[in-house]
Interface confidence: medium
Amino acid sequence: LVPHLGDREKRDSVCPQGKYIHPQNNSICCTKCHKGTYLYNDCPGPGQDTDCRECESGSFTASENHLRHCLSCSKCRKEMGQVEISSCTVDRDTVCGCRKNQYRHYWSENLFQCFNCSLCLNGTVHLSCQEKQNTVCTCHAGFFLRENECVSCSNCKKSLECTKLCLPQIENVKGTEDSGTT
């Protein structure tokens, strides 16, 4: 099966790398614009220069192209806790990230939210916090893990999963008391 090519891909494949086919004259291959620039006018003829213009402030192109407009710079999403790691330039989009001691949680391929790394209070760090993953905690005896925080077994309700973790603790205490009375 031949993979389906879009019109632009079909047109580009006719020309050598770094060139694209003139939209009005398919016998002409024009040189693509460098990153940081966009296509203002197609080349008038073979061997003639493509008219490329530099992207304006607030826009960019990150690779060679024949785009009629530069792409708008991304804005870091403050409401998701994101901070700017590096500003947008004409040839590179804004880079957003998280603060120190935070990790990225991806809600979708392009959307991440910054969350504080768990400190594992009342537990120990099993795996350190990573760029895209929270700390993995192991809780001390008498505590159970709920949403990656160690919570006292006194907060364990019968209906919750924690009964499996906390019940042996309660039984052991009772067992010790019983053995002490016999």
Partner: nanobody
Framework: EVQLLESGGGLVQPGGSLRLSCAAS????????MGWVRQAPGKGLEWVSQ????????YYTHSVKGRFTISRDNSKNTLYLQMNSLRAEDTAVYYC????????????WGQGTLVTVSS
């Protein structure tokens, strides 16, 4: 003291609608992103939707996109979730939460409001 009081849940038939409200107090409501998180019976917490402090950006988990609408009224310190075309899998306790680098107050949420979708 931070208080979040959710209301508006109930029993509804599949395809029906509900509007949840969350009355917030004890903090400067208009400074924070707010969200809705739900917990289905026997399951973990699931992020549902979020709205920025100025309400100019909203986010939804894939399964509710196009059906749920989050909104807020900063003058009333109230967060809303309009739920349309409800499905059985939307059955859960819904909690409203503040985002401050984590979902606060986390294990100290209020009672939430139970939404049951059943015929």
């Amino acid at each position: 003291e931070v208080q979040l009081l959710e209301s508006g849940g109930g029993l509804v038939q599949p395809g029906g609608s509900l509007r949840l409200s969350c009355a917030a107090s004890g903090f400067t409501f208009l400074k924070y992103s707010m969200g809705w998180v739900r917990q289905a019976p026997g399951k973990g917490l699931e992020w549902v939707s979020q709205i920025s402090d100025t309400a100019d950006r909203t986010y939804y988990t894939h399964s509710v996109k196009g059906r749920f609408t989050i909104s807020r009224d900063n003058s009333k310190n109230t967060l809303y979730l309009q739920m349309n075309s409800l499905r059985a899998e939307d059955t859960a306790v819904y909690y409203c939460a503040i985002y401050t680098g984590r979902w606060v107050p986390f294990e100290y949420w209020g009672q939430g409001t139970l939404v049951t979708v059943s015929s």
